[in-house]
Amino acid sequence: PEPPTACREKQYLINSQCCSLCQPGQKLVSDCTEFTETECLPCGESEFLDTWNRETHCHQHKYCDPNLGLRVQQKGTSETDTICTCEEGWHCTSEACESCVLHRSCSPGFGVKQIATGVSDTICEPCPVGFFSNVSSAFEKCHPWTSCETKDLVVQQAGTNKTDVVCGPQDRLRA
């Protein structure tokens, strides 16, 4: 028969014959022969391969370096890489999460729209009319101005995006 020029899925062509690829979690040791199947061996401790492959070396698991603010979110297996995330108060600088930076705080006049996670930074929004924030915070939302009327008080000083209104007593009507 004619030697193959293409092979089925999960196979590779070598020496004019189709050999099985190694399954995820195993590396190629020796090609198949006319008489025997491909020789594959499991990846070692702290190594992985996540696809059907003909790699002669497994990949090292990612190291979550605590000096860069990283910690292990999900331990790697022979078929998957380790997933890193950031320590509390920090978030990844990229999708690959190779280092971390401190969560950003929202300045006075801005409130937290979305609290930061291990993989995303704080999202701030300007406080709209009727709301304020007088602190720099990574957690505080814009607070509504105090309603003087509900306290039977009147506005003595208008609020801004950074300050609350100041309420005071109503002027007594003179007899």
């Epitope: 190629l28 040791v29 020789e39 499991p42």
Partner: antibody
């Protein structure tokens, strides 16, 4: 034709050195682990060591061979080598090269090494 | 280091006999199945008979079979033929960082 052919055996004095060669043909040498196995006269098979496929050529040796024996390969010449130093009388054996690591699919015919004064 | 213990060291049998050789590893082989059997005749290189504990290379007669997992393995010849008189070796593989392969001491099958 797929084959392995050893050479370089012979008589050597105790304490001496010898380099064995194994010429491979008929298969892709670069993507296959290669091993050495020896057999003393009238005795059983004994694994010497393995060199794995790939550019960095990781090696693994039997504990008794570490430090004295070194396996290497020249992919361009499709040749496997076994450098043997500080040879002793008990190293007298037929040395086989074989393809594979956890099982050996192809063997050479062997080359005899005699260590004697 | 992994140690392979093969038994018996020799056996005499007749053509047509069923022959069983056992092999025990001092610790589990890789993936519980990295165990091979080889046949060797005088003056010849060994020949792979069974790999991955129970897989026959194409061309090896079906009267040969292998079984077992972990530390205990068996080679069976269902009906011994004249060309089967030889020495048989098991070989277990531990890993690529701890003394790779170890052979059993061999079993010589002789004519009764």
């Amino acid at each position: 034709e797929v084959q392995l052919e050893e050479s370089g055996g012979g008589l050597v004095q105790p304490g001496g050195s010898l380099r064995l060669s194994c010429a491979a043909s008929g298969f892709d040498f670069s993507s296959n682990a290669m091993s050495w196995v020896r057999q003393a006269p009238g005795k059983g098979l004994e694994w010497v060591g393995t060199i794995y496929a790939g550019s960095n050529g990781n090696t693994d040796y039997a504990s008794w061979a570490k430090g004295r024996f070194t396996i290497s390969k020249d992919t361009s010449k499709t040749t496997l080598y076994l450098q043997m130093n500080s040879l002793r009388a008990e190293d007298t054996a037929t040395y086989f090269c074989a393809r594979g690591a956890s099982y050996f699919t192809l063997w050479g015919q062997g080359t005899l090494v005699t260590v004697s004064s | 280091d992994i140690v392979m213990t093969q038994s018996p060291s020799s056996l005499s049998a007749s053509v047509g006999d069923r022959v069983t050789i056992t092999c025990q590893a001092s610790e589990s082989v890789v993936s519980n199945n990295r165990l091979a059997w080889y046949q060797q005749k005088p003056g010849q290189a060994p020949k792979l008979l069974i790999y991955l504990a129970s897989t026959l290379p194409s061309g090896v007669p079906s009267r040969f079979s292998g079984s077992g997992s972990g530390t205990d393995f068996t080679l069976t010849i269902s009906s011994l033929q004249p060309e089967d008189f030889a020495t048989y070796y098991c070989a277990g593989y531990k890993s690529s960082s701890t003394d790779g392969t170890a052979f059993g001491q061999g079993t010589k099958v002789v004519i009764k």
